[in-house]
Interface confidence: low
Amino acid sequence: WELTILHTNDVHSRLEQTSEDSSKCVNASRCMGGVARLFTKVQQIRRAEPNVLLLDAGDQYQGTIWFTVYKGAEVAHFMNALRYDAMALGNHEFDNGVEGLIEPLLKEAKFPILSANIKAKGPLASQISGLYLPYKVLPVGDEVVGIVGYTSKETPFLSNPGTNLVFEDEITALQPEVDKLKTLNVNKIIALGHSGFETDKLIAQKVRGVDVVVGGHSNTFLYTGNPPSKEVPAGKYPFIVTSDDGRKVPVVQAYAFGKYLGYLKIEFDERGNVISSHGNPILLNSSIPEDPSIKADINKWRIKLDNYSTQELGKTIVYLDGSSQSCRFRECNMGNLICDAMINNNLRHADEMFWNHVSMCILNGGGIRSPIDERNNGTITWENLAAVLPFGGTFDLVQLKGSTLKKAFEHSVHRYGQSTGEFLQVGGIHVVYDLSRKPGDRVVKLDVLCTKCRVPSYDPLKMDEIYKVILPNFLANGGDGFQMIKDELLRHDSGDQDINVVSTYISKMKVIYPAVEGRIKFS
Amino acid sequence: WELTILHTNDVHSRLEQTSEDSSKCVNASRCMGGVARLFTKVQQIRRAEPNVLLLDAGDQYQGTIWFTVYKGAEVAHFMNALRYDAMALGNHEFDNGVEGLIEPLLKEAKFPILSANIKAKGPLASQISGLYLPYKVLPVGDEVVGIVGYTSKETPFLSNPGTNLVFEDEITALQPEVDKLKTLNVNKIIALGHSGFETDKLIAQKVRGVDVVVGGHSNTFLYTGNPPSKEVPAGKYPFIVTSDDGRKVPVVQAYAFGKYLGYLKIEFDERGNVISSHGNPILLNSSIPEDPSIKADINKWRIKLDNYSTQELGKTIVYLDGSSQSCRFRECNMGNLICDAMINNNLRHADEMFWNHVSMCILNGGGIRSPIDERNNGTITWENLAAVLPFGGTFDLVQLKGSTLKKAFEHSVHRYGQSTGEFLQVGGIHVVYDLSRKPGDRVVKLDVLCTKCRVPSYDPLKMDEIYKVILPNFLANGGDGFQMIKDELLRHDSGDQDINVVSTYISKMKVIYPAVEGRIKFS
């Protein structure tokens, strides 16, 4: 019996087609993805093949103005329109709190939303009961397939799930649910979830009875053969894990941003054993036309976005200096503003020993693309912020050794004075450079804001200590020459849309007045 | 003949039990102090020992919502209930002016209230006559003991005693009163007062005829042996001073906030000479039960307070360090929070040339009277803020010349290290001190946030420039020795109530996390 699994993950509000790098579509003839194009491909496969499941492995929420404005209603609406069969909860589904998940998505979705390792307690337990499930048994042709969900146990550090949801260890929580499915004579089981490729592989290895793992969170690109675009494969598609009980378990993920549609064909024997698996992600490029009815619907929903982007978010009473003349050469107040917003967006006070899990921010000055003039009555709009941060990136959470950070700051000024983008803006960091010293040895002082403390204060960076840092995904991926970050990072969790982070902060603060305050000095 | 002296000082409205750091009690099983617990211990000692005096060395007034609401009536009521034998006036007893001392306390207290170095003049002299005394002779068993009071001569700089009270030098004023007691054949004399440990020791050394000194004001903790809590002893208990006429004079103080009950046993010979002294402060921890009748009375009085100020204003995820150990010695994050709130409350963007009319804040560390513990779910209430800023002052706008500000910062550290209140917390100012230099020449760097600029940044202070500064009315009026501000200010506009400024800021910010960020440095 053959099953076709179509899968997406980490779509992050890319409802409209995008450029090849998943930023805003500029030249339509070269654009990719988007739900209208996805629907064309899904429908084509549904018509051609008998047993098809369309699954999403979480993080539909967060990433563009679509989410900012529609707050998840757009996810429910268009996933319903595409007739998804199931979705697993990702960490970003909690970005607007539990209420922001329940009302727009859980109550509106016409497909099951799954997570076996999230347990509700207190008053929330009855309120959320039945709105998400640990698993769902789906009829597919003449057979049934069990889908069991999971979500990163790090979610309390990555989003805002509140105090009434407990995130258990994935493997510990999945095993009893899979066992239950077995007792229900379900012999074909897919683990669909959002914990990252390493955890996906562990689930394949450790959870008895899981036949296929469809994952997300780590934006992993797998491909067999010559990849069709710029993404470099982390392994073959599917990635085969040998389980502890000797089975070959295919693990898949489909990069991110709706650029690809994961396409996995599984052959099961009559007892539900996987006897073959093959496929590849399908690049959703302009050779696939956008479905006209979905496109028309997108255009209708689009109108509200255009109005939103010109509305006032808040005010500035100072010039927000995002000029390259400043931000690539010295501390600039636009850099300070953005870093302050990045930290503010990552407040997760979960432990008495730590005032927060993260206190540091770095931001390549070259990623700041425009100033904002305060002389327009101080008004700041989404449109203004889109000029400052036009690349549609995310502000991510990484774990790095102190020694890696030191290398990053040396790289920041290794060719200082040439107006290059790698000059770092900071938050929760005090750095002093001596440019008279040779490149690679110019950082003479690097103090960082403690986290394991009740009163935040600055201490010298320790080379062997592991630090959490918020930074643009561009830097996490080694951009602007920060290869050491990419090569040496110990953990990487994708975060919220860059503009959204800053706009939320400005809306919260109402009036802003960031200063140049001595975070970066030259001795 | 043996005398037991039980003593408190600097209780500062801690009528209810508190956390170990004397902030609001969070976990009752670990709480300390409070009048109900104090009464249990006092009664236990009164039952067990024949000759007991219960004395208070001043500063019952000011510190929590109890004083804000009841304005001293609570002090009289509960000190009467505990049957104090005498109290010396502290500087804070004048915080609501002389009227605020006379009506609720002096007229209602059933015990003598003492100060030998405060002399009333003008119309006040007849009004206050007999309501406080220079000394009182108390019968104790078959003997009599003279208690002579004194109050910090700095009180006019620290509180609001008005113009009709003269505060004389303690030693000069005490000697004739002690001499008078000697002529009355009182041969056992206790000096009970509120001028700080250094003055207490001087009194022991210089005032002939004083047998014991029971002090306050400097929150001095003395202990013999291993201290029972977090306070680090400044010396042994009692601290023995050899007087100029060769006697060994015990000097005691009992920290502050009602956390300890001072317990001193003195043995006198038949001529009134001290032949032995020993004891220790008793930590009033949860091993001592709260007296049920006093506790019931506290609960009855409490009702009025709960309505007043127990609603959450916002949250903190950091410890708001308002301890005198921090705020009188170095940059503290409570000072930063308050200054940031003061600037935020004074945003008036009226001119393109100026991002704001004012960018600077100074705040005497001594005006920060309590920390706020974040471990109470982060909740901050008006009540919490009233303990931090209990003086009901205002945050005012002044115009000063740069030279005046420089003098103020020199004054800030002119006698650094003595836990005096004039150490300045700041906002919009970066100051560097070199304490190896002589007083008056210790400010080696003073940079201030520009106002006539579109991007706020720090520039060196200019001596001849006129600056606007936000500061407590206490400083504008020359308090804590800042005479230069009072004398040289060019303009003074009174501002908003201090707690209100901070509470509004916290409500606006919702979640706060002020850091120690290098505003104040020592080279």
Partner: antibody
Framework: EIQLQQSGPELVKPGASVKVSCKAS????????MYWVKQSHGKSLEWIGY????????SYNQKFKGKATLTVDKSSSTAYMHLNSLTSEDSAVYYC?????????????WGQGTLVTVSA | DAVMTQTPKFLLVSAGDRVTITCKAS??????VAWYQQKPGQSPKLLIY???NRYTGVPDRFTGSGYGTDFTFTISTVQAEDLAVYFC????????FGAGTKLELK
């Protein structure tokens, strides 16, 4: 050097109007209010009003409302005062003045004055 | 508007004299008071602002004091070049000048 250069003397007939100019140099014109002050012969000084060159906002002494109209031309850094329905009472020296700083109206910089004589 | 009553109208002085001029405000104007000197045929010159602060370049023989309603302007030792008309001005409540005091040689 900060300078305020006023237009020359005017002799006008009763009922006519006159426009006095004040050209500023040596500072950012739009950053400071421009004040106008009247001094009748042998008399004290009277404040007429001021204009904010940045946005053209004006404030007038009640006594001169309807008599004086203040305008600016930002491109030439020039302030103007138009006086209408002139009578002999309007004969005076008129000064433009700029403040010391821009918090208060302490007039540190003055034009040389323009004598307006109203005579039949 | 606060009215500024300036006295005296005239002062006969000799070189070296000490001269005091007073201005009384009809209501409190805090310390929002300035003093000006005007010589014949010239524009006024700012001498004192904020009641007691000497403007740049003004000799220290000129001093001002006062707060609220009563203000004093003093020339400690009159010199020949000080013969002029002196005006007070407030800008706390609208903006008004005193009537002026003329210094003349005896």
């Amino acid at each position: 050097e900060i300078q305020l250069q006023q237009s020359g003397p005017e002799l006008v007939k009763p009922g006519a109007s006159v426009k006095v100019s004040c050209k500023a140099s040596g500072y950012a014109f739009t950053s400071y209010n421009m004040y106008w002050v009247k001094q009748s012969h042998g008399k004290s000084l009277e404040w007429i009003g001021y204009i904010d060159p940045y946005n053209g906002g004006t404030s007038y002494n009640q006594k001169f409302k309807g008599k004086a109209t203040l305008t600016v031309d930002k491109s030439s850094s020039t302030a103007y005062m138009h006086l209408n329905s002139l009578t002999s009472e309007d004969s005076a020296v008129y000064y433009c003045a700029r403040g010391y700083g821009n918090y208060k109206a302490w007039f540190a910089y003055w034009g040389q004055g323009t004598l307006v004589t109203v005579s039949a | 508007d606060a009215v500024m009553t300036q006295t005296p109208k005239f002062l006969l002085v000799s070189a070296g004299d000490r001269v005091t001029i007073t201005c009384k405000a009809s209501q409190s104007v805090t310390n929002d008071v300035a003093w000006y000197q005007q010589k014949p045929g010239q524009s006024p010159k700012l001498l004192i602002y904020y009641a007691s602060n000497r403007y740049t370049g003004v000799p220290d023989r000129f001093t001002g004091s006062g707060y609220g309603t009563d203000f004093t302007f003093t020339i400690s030792t009159v010199q020949a070049e000080d013969l002029a008309v002196y005006f007070c001005q407030q800008d706390y409540s609208s903006l008004t000048f005193g009537a002026g005091t003329k210094l003349e040689l005896k």
